[in-house]
């Protein structure tokens, strides 16, 4: 749902560098050989130095002289290495083994006209705890020109993604160009630049709780109802909806454009006895921004007359006539609001 974004490769928004580490910290990539040097002057020469890994008292070494060589280090070797002389601590050498971050793929969205834009990235593998992300941004508007700023990004363990909020006030008409910088102690990577317009980017979440049900006595009707997504507040901005439906065996949809703020609709031309796929999508009433994604598919089948068995076992009841076949069916069921059929049928 980010087809409205554009790349601006030529603009450099900020310098994306590896993170500084505390003085004396040794950094390494996994698999490397690392030399740790006990920092005290007294550790020089041929003295016997005792080393302990702070993460576990079981890992100990004794060296003659002040250097400890660790081969094929792994992420789990990260920690403090304590060197001691005569059972007294001489120094601590912090080791940080890390993997450089992967190149982030940034996507930005704004789910309603009242909220900030959110830019996020879901790494393909869990980043190391030391990995940090920052969003470099340039705001371009007609009045104030350009302004550069940075936004800190939080990593959510639950969502497994980095997320950054770009402040946009209601009614703002501004362009933003953004780039995500992800860095840790052994490397850094920037995403491609993404550009978005504060209003044009608005894209609601798909409508929620779509229900498709048969209407008794109506073999070609389907009643469809839904609700606005949780992320949309209909007391400020209304939504318009499109509904599309098709028989399960068809690829072609019939699309209906519905009046603003209508949360239900009756399909009148469903095929008898056939299961149909139905979806709905929403957009701000004044065509602000983008259509939402289509809601997940929900299926429904129109009402089917159940044949009654006579005592003789004959499967026919001449009095059972569908309402649809009667002359005055308009009066039998409250007529639904008229919908405009657009682009019907649509091949998707």
């Amino acid at each position: 749902h980010h087809h409205h974004h554009h790349h601006h490769h030529h603009l450099v928004l900020g310098s994306c560098r590896a993170l500084e580490v505390a003085n004396g910290t040794v950094t390494s990539l996994p698999g490397a050989t690392v030399t740790l040097i006990c920092p005290g002057k007294e550790a020089a020469g041929n003295v016997t130095i005792h080393w302990v890994y702070s993460g576990s008292q079981n890992r100990e070494w004794t060296t003659t002289g002040n250097t400890l060589v660790l081969r094929d280090v792994q992420l789990s070797d990260t920690g403090d290495y304590l060197c001691s002389l005569n059972d007294h601590l001489v120094g601590t050498v912090p080791l940080l083994v890390d993997v450089p971050p992967e190149e982030p793929k940034l996507s930005c969205f704004r789910k309603n006209p009242l909220v900030n834009a959110i830019c996020e990235w879901r790494p393909s593998s869990t980043p190391s705890p030391t990995t940090k992300a920052v969003l470099f941004a340039k705001k371009i508007n007609t009045t104030n020109g350009k302004s550069d700023f940075q936004v800190p990004c939080q990593y959510s363990q639950q969502l497994k993604s980095f997320s950054c909020q770009v402040e946009i006030l209601e009614g703002d008409k501004v362009y933003h160009i953004v780039s995500l910088c992800v860095a840790n102690s052994v490397g850094s990577k920037s995403s491609h630049n993404e550009a978005f317009h504060s209003l044009k980017m608005v894209q609601p979440d798909p409508p929620a709780n779509l229900v498709v049900s048969a209407i008794p006595g109506r073999p070609r009707w389907l009643k469809v109802s839904w609700q606005h997504p949780e992320t949309w507040d209909p007391s400020y901005y209304l939504l318009q909806f499109q509904l599309r439906y098709r028989p399960v065996w068809s690829k072609e949809f019939t699309v209906l454009l519905l009046p603003v703020a209508q949360y239900q609709c009756v399909i009148h031309d469903a095929l008898r006895g056939v299961k149909h796929v139905v979806q709905v999508r929403g957009k701000e009433e004044l065509d602000l921004g983008q259509w939402s994604e289509w809601s997940p598919e929900v299926t429904g089948t129109p009402w089917i007359a159940e044949p009654r068995t006579t005592p003789a076992g004959i499967l026919w009841n001449p009095t059972q006539v569908s309402v649809e076949d009667s002359a005055n069916h308009e009066d039998q069921y409250e007529s639904s609001t008229e919908a405009t059929s657009v682009l019907a049928p649509v091949q998707e």
Epitope: G40, K41, Q57, S84, N86, D87, H88, L89, G91
Partner: antibody, heavy 116, light 107 residues
């Protein structure tokens, strides 16, 4: 092997004093930590600083920096120079060689009294 | 500087009792902690180094435990000779730091 402090005295506020720590049965040249600790009457132990013998490596408590200086004067002696003494510096001053598992040696201490 | 906080400042117990002295460091000192015993008018005597290793000649009634920031000295089967002041000490030459001391009175 033993250590002995000397030079403790009664001095006036503002005076300077140098204490000596002499080793018997071993020499400093093998690279020891020689440390000075003091104890005011009826109070606890307070670390002043250490020198790693055979080098110029010295460490001091933050309160002692500038006013106290530890030096190695020979292969068997170390000194503690104290300046601008006040009544709060009145204490027994110990020198110690602490080698953990290889033994721990403290002198008997020498008393410094600062009084007008 | 690292601060070593010792509790209690004084404890009274009968012969045969067990006494526990606590020492807390203001930051992680791993296992680099020493315990000393000092009797009035005497120099300090090393009891335990590296938090739990008994120094030569020290009875096994003395036991040190802990690592990181929290340490304990336990004296079991208390004897009259154990009446003294006990000090914990951060064991790093670049910065020794003593606790305030715990006076053990044997009744």
């Amino acid at each position: 092997q033993s250590l002995e402090e000397s030079g403790g005295d009664l001095v006036k506020p503002g005076a300077s004093l140098t204490l000596a720590c002499t080793a018997s049965g071993f020499s400093f040249s093998s690279g020891y930590y020689m440390c000075w600790v003091r104890q005011a009457p009826g109070k606890g132990l307070e670390w002043i600083g250490c020198i790693y013998t055979g080098s110029d490596t010295t460490y001091y408590a933050s309160w002692a920096k500038g006013r106290f200086t530890i030096s190695e004067t020979s292969s068997t002696a170390a000194t503690l120079q104290m300046t601008s003494l006040t009544a709060a510096d009145t204490a027994t001053y110990f020198c110690a060689r602490d080698l953990g598992s290889r033994g721990n040696l403290w002198g008997p201490g020498t008393l410094v009294t600062v009084s007008s | 500087d690292i601060v070593m906080t010792q509790t209690p400042s004084s404890v009274s117990a009968a012969v045969g009792d067990t006494v526990t002295i606590n020492c807390q460091a203001s930051e992680n000192i791993y296992s680099f902690l020493t315990w000393y015993q000092q009797k009035p008018g005497q120099r300090p005597k090393l009891l335990i180094y590296r938090a739990s290793t008994l120094a030569s000649g020290v009875p096994s009634r003395f036991k040190g435990s802990g690592s990181g920031t929290d340490f304990t000295l336990t004296i079991s089967d208390l004897e009259c000779a154990d009446a003294a002041t006990y000090y914990c000490q951060r064991n790093a030459y670049s910065s020794w730091a003593f606790g305030g001391g715990t006076e053990v009175v044997v009744k």
